[in-house]
């Protein structure tokens, strides 16, 4: 059961996992949340009538029934993690806690203009997981400015204290807002031969890799396969860290793979979502349950249901036995990885999907691309919208992209007339046109957000948001396209889509079914060749056949440029403008999305 | 003592090209970051490309993409920048430098080792 709320002067008694200091009991949630063990946990805020060394202290439990007593206790907060519940969570932190010193080890100290500037400087330090930063009004004037910039072994402070005129707070790089470099390579045949800081069992280096990149301390790792010839040291999976960041000795070794950190590029990737079923592969650890199921996917997803399960095992039925049913074997261990891996005995191994929630909705697997023909096929672009107006009459007026639960991105030059979004109606899920009748469900749009420095399509700035009045809950129809991650500035994109239920030519009709087309980006300076009356700036990006045929068109407008990029579909650009359709060297030219991210992420998480 | 030696700088029309070599002695390219900055009279120092030599990850600032390519040869110590279609504002001293942390590749607040840098001007 999802519960939400946290319960004042309340504590939880017993079922202590650790303890941990935070600076608010909401964040002691999210640490609760992220923990692979705490279902519950109890905070202490500051209070006269509480011992000050017990201020902030988060205390992380566990309990085999999901509850555990509760005893009325002042200055006592408490509350249940999210693994219970089915919405979206992030780690993402950027409060900043005024008169709080949270205590790390202080690595860097350097002199700042703000607090914002302390933060980026953490956001972009590959070691820091918060900062504090003594202000102006600092009483010692040696310490006024600085910007200390600290770590911990578990990335939460040692402790917590009152400090007037100081501001604390974390990194933002769980919110994709470093400039870190992403190195997404893997190194076959390859040892990284720095300090172990942890190690765990991983059936391959993908998992290995997004072990480390929600590890706080992980930089990098190396990963040995079953093949390593040490049987002992098979499918160990070694946390790595060094003093710069990077590993300093690679040693060629058959069999062993290494690789870095994602921290820097998290939201264009599944980070804690291990969706992969491994065979022949038994995962050893803590048994919560022996369950009959029909298959292996039938045992995740009773692994997934458990909240206390974290992987699991299922071992096929012998012949007709148990109705054709086979044991499916719901585990956990103390760090949420198997404490041992076996291969050869027959098993399907696999993890519990429930962590999938706290990755975004947007990295998950939606239905292979369908190869050939131009009509679309339901479920194929899951983020795409038609956006109508019903005034005077009902029509779709431009097309746009679920961003989030309850935004959905598109062009401003779409509301050209539009007086309020009153006349507009979201719909989503919808392949034909056709469906749409009388009775047919939409989101009402509560607010238009048009970009302030928006004039005309062909002078950029062409982006706008729409908030919905209700939230969308996500399905295989009807669900989020990533945003590019400002780490991803350099990736070339080269499987990139338009679509739209716009002209299939100039002089046209709005079609029926969702059309898509295949096309190539173009370069900004190849693209301003081919309008020389006009300005394609860096907030633009071009894409288009040399010899035209594919383009998008009128009726296309604010709909998505989707671009496939390690598994994963990223909002490249936005429909925006471009000289006639499908024309000879006149490329599309679209809203560049990756140079508004901090405009969107500032719009969609204002207060 | 780290030396970073740039070369192969020059005068160009404008739409013509050039190499620019950096050759490193007393550190190693392997395994760190390598940039390419540019800095023109009055404007701020800016990121132009990197690479990870490692695995060759490479970065490039928006308003070159397309045009220059940043390469290495671990064997020679040696990171190039080769630069297309060069343009009038592509003018600037170019400096080439040596990070030993992981880095924002463009940023060049977090480069060690700077090279003395060496002039590309590119005419109309």
């Known amino acids: 059961e999802c519960v939400t709320q946290l319960l004042k002067d309340t504590c939880f008694e017993g079922g202590d996992i650790t303890t941990v200091f935070t600076p608010s009991a909401k964040y002691c949630q999210v640490v609760c949340t992220y923990h692979p063990r705490c279902l519950l946990f109890t905070f202490t805020a500051e209070s006269p009538s509480e011992d000050p060394t017990r201020w902030f202290t988060c205390v992380l439990k566990d309990s085999v029934t999901e509850t555990l007593p509760r005893v009325n206790r002042t200055a006592a907060i408490s509350g249940y993690s999210f693994k219970q519940c089915s919405h979206q969570i992030s780690a993402c932190n950027k409060d900043i806690y005024v008169d709080l010193d949270m205590k790390g080890i202080n690595y860097n100290s350097s002199v700042a203009k703000s607090a914002q500037e302390c933060q980026e400087r953490c956001t972009d330090d590959v070691h820091c997981h918060f900062f504090t930063y003594a202000t102006r009004q600092f009483p010692s004037l040696e310490h006024r400015n600085i910007c200390l910039l600290k770590h911990t072994q578990t990335g939460t402070p040692t402790r917590i204290t009152k400090l007037d005129k100081v501001v604390s707070g974390f990194s933002l790089k769980s919110c994709a807002l470093s400039n870190l470099a992403c190195i997404r390579d893997i190194f076959p045949n390859t040892v990284f031969a720095d300090s172990n800081i942890d190690s765990v069992m991983a059936p391959d280096a993908f998992v290995c890799g997004r072990i480390c990149t929600h590890h706080p301390g992980c930089l990098f790792f190396t990963f040995f396969s079953q093949e390593w010839p040490k049987e002992s040291q098979r499918n160990l999976c070694l946390l790595k860290t060094s003093e710069s960041g990077l590993p300093s000795t690679r040693i060629k070794k058959s069999k062993a793979l290494s690789g870095f950190s994602l921290q820097s590029c998290r939201h264009s990737i599944p980070v804690f979502c291990h969706s992969s079923f491994y065979h022949d592969t038994d995962f050893l650890g803590e048994e919560l349950d022996i369950v009959a199921a029909k298959s292996h996917e039938a045992c995740q997803k009773l692994c997934t249901n458990a909240v206390r399960c974290q992987f699991f095992t299922y071992t096929p039925a012998q012949a007709s036995c148990n109705e054709g049913k086979g044991k499916c074997y719901l585990k956990l261990s103390s760090n949420g990885s198997p404490t041992k891996i076996l291969h050869g005995r027959g098993g399907i191994s696999g993890y519990t999907l429930r962590l999938c929630k706290m990755d975004n909705e947007c990295t998950t697997k939606i239905k292979p691309r369908i190869v050939g023909g131009t009509a679309s096929v339901r479920g194929e672009w899951p983020w795409q919208v038609t956006l109508h107006t019903t005034s005077p009459t009902q029509r779709h007026l431009c097309g746009g992209s679920i961003i989030g639960n309850q935004w959905i991105l598109t062009a401003a030059h779409c509301f050209y007339g539009v007086e309020s979004p009153k006349i507009l109606r979201v719909y989503s899920g919808i392949l034909n046109q056709s469906e749409i009748k009388e009775d047919t469900s939409f989101f009402g749009v509560q607010e238009i957000i048009i970009h302030d420095q928006y004039k005309m399509a062909e002078s950029g700035y062409d982006i706008a948001l729409l908030k919905l009045e209700t939230t969308v809950n996500y399905t295989d129809s009807q669900r989020p396209i990533c945003l590019p991650s400002k780490g991803d500035r350099n990736v070339i994109y080269t499987d990139c889509w338009v679509t739209g239920w716009g002209y299939r030519k100039l002089r046209d009709k709005i079609q029926n079914t969702l059309q898509k087309a295949k096309i190539p980006l173009v370069t900004n300076e190849e693209c301003q060749k081919r309008y020389r009356g006009h300005k394609i700036t860096h907030k633009m990006i071009c894409a288009g056949y040399r010899e035209g045929g594919k383009d998008a068109c009128k009726g296309d407008s604010g709909g998505p440029l989707s671009c496939k990029h390690n598994e994963v579909w990223h909002l490249v650009g936005i429909t925006s403008w471009g000289e006639g359709c499908a024309q000879r060297e006149r490329p599309g030219v679209y809203t560049n999305v990756v140079e508004y991210v901090d405009w969107i992420l500032e719009k969609t998480q204002a207060v | 003592q780290v030396q970073l030696q740039e070369s192969g700088g020059g005068s160009v029309q404008a739409g013509g090209s050039l190499r620019l070599s950096c050759v490193a002695s007393?550190?190693?390219?392997?395994?760190?970051?390598v940039g390419w900055f540019r800095q023109a009279p009055g404007k701020e120092r800016e990121g132009v490309a990197a690479?990870?030599?490692?695995?060759?990850?490479?970065y490039y600032a928006d308003s070159v993409k397309g045009r220059f390519t940043i390469s290495q040869d671990n064997a020679k110590n040696t990171v190039y920048l080769q630069m297309d279609s060069l343009k009038p504002e592509d003018t600037a001293t170019y400096y080439c430098?040596?990070?030993?942390?992981?880095?924002?590749?463009?940023?060049?607040?977090?480069?060690?080792?700077w090279g003395q840098g060496t002039q590309v001007t590119v005419s109309s």
């Open positions: 690479i990870y030599s490692l695995g060759g990850s490479t």
């Open positions: 430098a040596g990070a030993i942390t992981w880095v924002p590749p463009l940023s060049h607040r977090r480069y060690t080792y």
């Open positions: 007393g550190y190693t390219f392997n395994n760190n970051f």
